[in-house]
Interface confidence: medium
């Protein structure tokens, strides 16, 4: 039967039984969160999309799923990235005590993965789905990130730090989720500051990248908020991270790196 | 800092209920799993099960379920724990505790203990 | 359920001597990585207090004479030097399954 051509990928293939396995393996793995119901939390997430139009989705669809996936980070262990994932990582599977959206459950059972259904159809829709340029920014995926990123950062409390990446034209871009959500939903009554931490690309880059223009940015942003701002250019990631595995390495100095360290108030 | 401070000693009558409180402070209730843990000389230590008082999420020892009733408040930040139909072998102290939460799904905190004595 | 078995029920060690407790699980408490067995003091007229935590991680504020060892099904607590003050119940538990267990406990007496 006819189906909506959509110009982005389609669902993941096997979505239901990823969601429901990453489940299952995220309670064994986390103790804490035995009482989630994995079938109640998949079709909480299948009642998000499944039957809807695409490119209506609104936040109030995941609610029931966030609701079920409620978890709170502890103060100063949230860690933010842009356009450097894989680095955030890294290294919150090193520093086993801060957390990534996608260390939280909804962010693990939904990273790297696409979805999508129909209107008044039961079926998931594993052809195409939309774009979030080329058709749509109402659509399932982007919404779902949306609807948690903004929940991530709302919980945040004490110091928040974020992971940039220093090799980007814009190192600080508005138009990332970090820009355009997180920065905005940080809430100053429960975060004493955001500290920026710039990723080197190049391995004899020692330009200070804390005073890129998008830097300053940031900094205007975040202090209009009146959260506090901090910055520090991490010049070599593979030692940062060797340092944060073996901090008593004699070769790795105090702190995070041996780079500038902007306060600013 | 944490602390959990727990109700005072109950004796009670076979077959009737009891119903203790363990009150947090120093830490956000509801971003902690709360949980329970039974001693007797006989069995030792055994778990019952947690709150979380966050969405209202319980689990439960499949040996304390219908036995044991977790509920929290999250307006005074106090969990209870209401065990029905007594019988000696309730009699123990009982625990509340709390985890490290995320990644740390250990007993870090203790409250010091509640006794019951079930009388016939 | 998986049951720890603790061994050995009591033991009376010198002061200044090594103590060794055993806990083995009827079934493996390893997953991903992680040995999710923790070992627990308890005193009389006390709550338990954590001094190992995934198998072999020691707790903050622990003295270093506690330690922590094993995989999968056997663990091990070691106390090296044993002081007056070690005087007390040691109880091993899992939470990789639910129920979370406890072993029977081992008391641990200084001579």
């Known amino acids: 039967r006819w189906r909506q051509q959509w110009s982005g990928s389609g669902t993941t293939s096997r979505f239901p039984e990823t969601v429901l396995a990453r489940c299952v393996k995220y309670t064994e793995v986390h103790p804490e969160m035995r009482h989630v119901d994995c079938q109640s939390v998949w079709d909480a997430f299948k009642g998000a999309f499944i039957s809807k139009y695409p490119c209506n989705i609104t936040e109030e669809d995941y609610q029931p799923l966030v609701k079920l996936g409620t978890q709170t980070v502890p103060c100063n262990k949230t860690l933010l990235w842009s356009r450097i994932k894989d680095l955030a990582h890294q290294f919150t599977q090193v520093q086993r005590d801060m957390f990534t959206l996608e260390d939280m459950l909804l962010g693990y059972l939904a990273d790297d993965l696409t979805w999508c259904g129909e209107f008044n159809t039961f079926e998931i829709n594993y052809q195409s789905c939309p774009d979030w340029r080329k058709d749509c920014s109402n659509n399932p995926v982007s919404v779902f990130w949306k609807t948690v990123s903004r929940r991530f950062a709302e919980t945040a409390c004490g110091v928040v730090h974020v992971m940039l990446n220093g090799s980007r034209s814009k190192i600080f871009d508005k138009n990332s989720t970090f820009g355009s959500v997180e920065v905005h939903n940080l809430q100053p009554e429960k975060v004493q500051a955001l500290e920026a931490w710039v990723i080197h690309g190049g391995r004899e880059d020692s330009r200070d990248l804390c005073q890129d223009p998008t830097i300053k940015e940031l900094e205007s942003i975040i202090s209009k908020r009146n959260i506090r701002f901090f910055c520090k250019n991490i010049y070599r990631p593979d030692k940062f991270l060797q340092c944060v595995k073996n901090p008593e390495d004699s070769s790795c100095l105090s702190g995070i790196s041996a780079s500038h360290h902007h306060h600013h108030h | 800092q944490v602390q959990l401070q727990q109700s005072g000693a109950e004796l009670v009558r076979s077959g009737a209920s009891v119903k203790m409180s363990c009150k947090a402070s120093g830490y956000t209730f509801t971003s902690f799993n709360m949980h329970w843990v039974k001693e007797t000389p006989g069995q030792g230590l055994e778990w019952i099960g947690y709150i979380y008082p966050g969405n209202g999420g319980t689990n439960y020892n499949q040996k304390f379920k219908g036995k044991a009733t977790l509920t929290a408040d999250t307006s005074s930040s106090t969990a209870y724990m209401q065990i029905s139909s007594l019988t000696s072998e309730d009699s123990a102290v009982y625990f509340c505790?709390?985890?490290?939460?995320?990644?740390?799904?250990?007993?870090?905190?203790w409250g010091q203990g509640t006794l019951v004595t079930v009388s016939s | 359920d998986i049951v720890l078995t603790q061994s050995p029920a009591s033991l009376a060690v010198s002061l200044g001597q090594r103590a060794t407790i055993s806990c083995r699980a009827s079934?493996?408490?390893?997953?991903?990585?992680?040995?999710?067995m923790h070992w627990y003091q308890q005193k009389p007229g006390q709550p338990p207090k954590l001094l190992i935590y995934?198998?072999?991680n020691l707790e903050s504020g622990v003295p270093a004479r506690f330690s922590g060892s094993g995989s999968r099904t056997d663990f091990t607590l070691t106390i090296d030097p044993v002081e007056a003050d070690d005087a007390a119940t040691y109880y091993c538990q899992q939470n990789k399954e639910d129920p979370w267990t406890f072993g029977g406990g081992t008391k641990l007496e200084i001579k």
């Open positions: 079934e493996s408490v390893d997953s991903y990585g992680n040995g999710f």
């Open positions: 995934l198998a072999s």
């Open positions: 505790a709390r985890t490290g939460g995320l990644r740390r799904a250990y007993f870090t905190y």
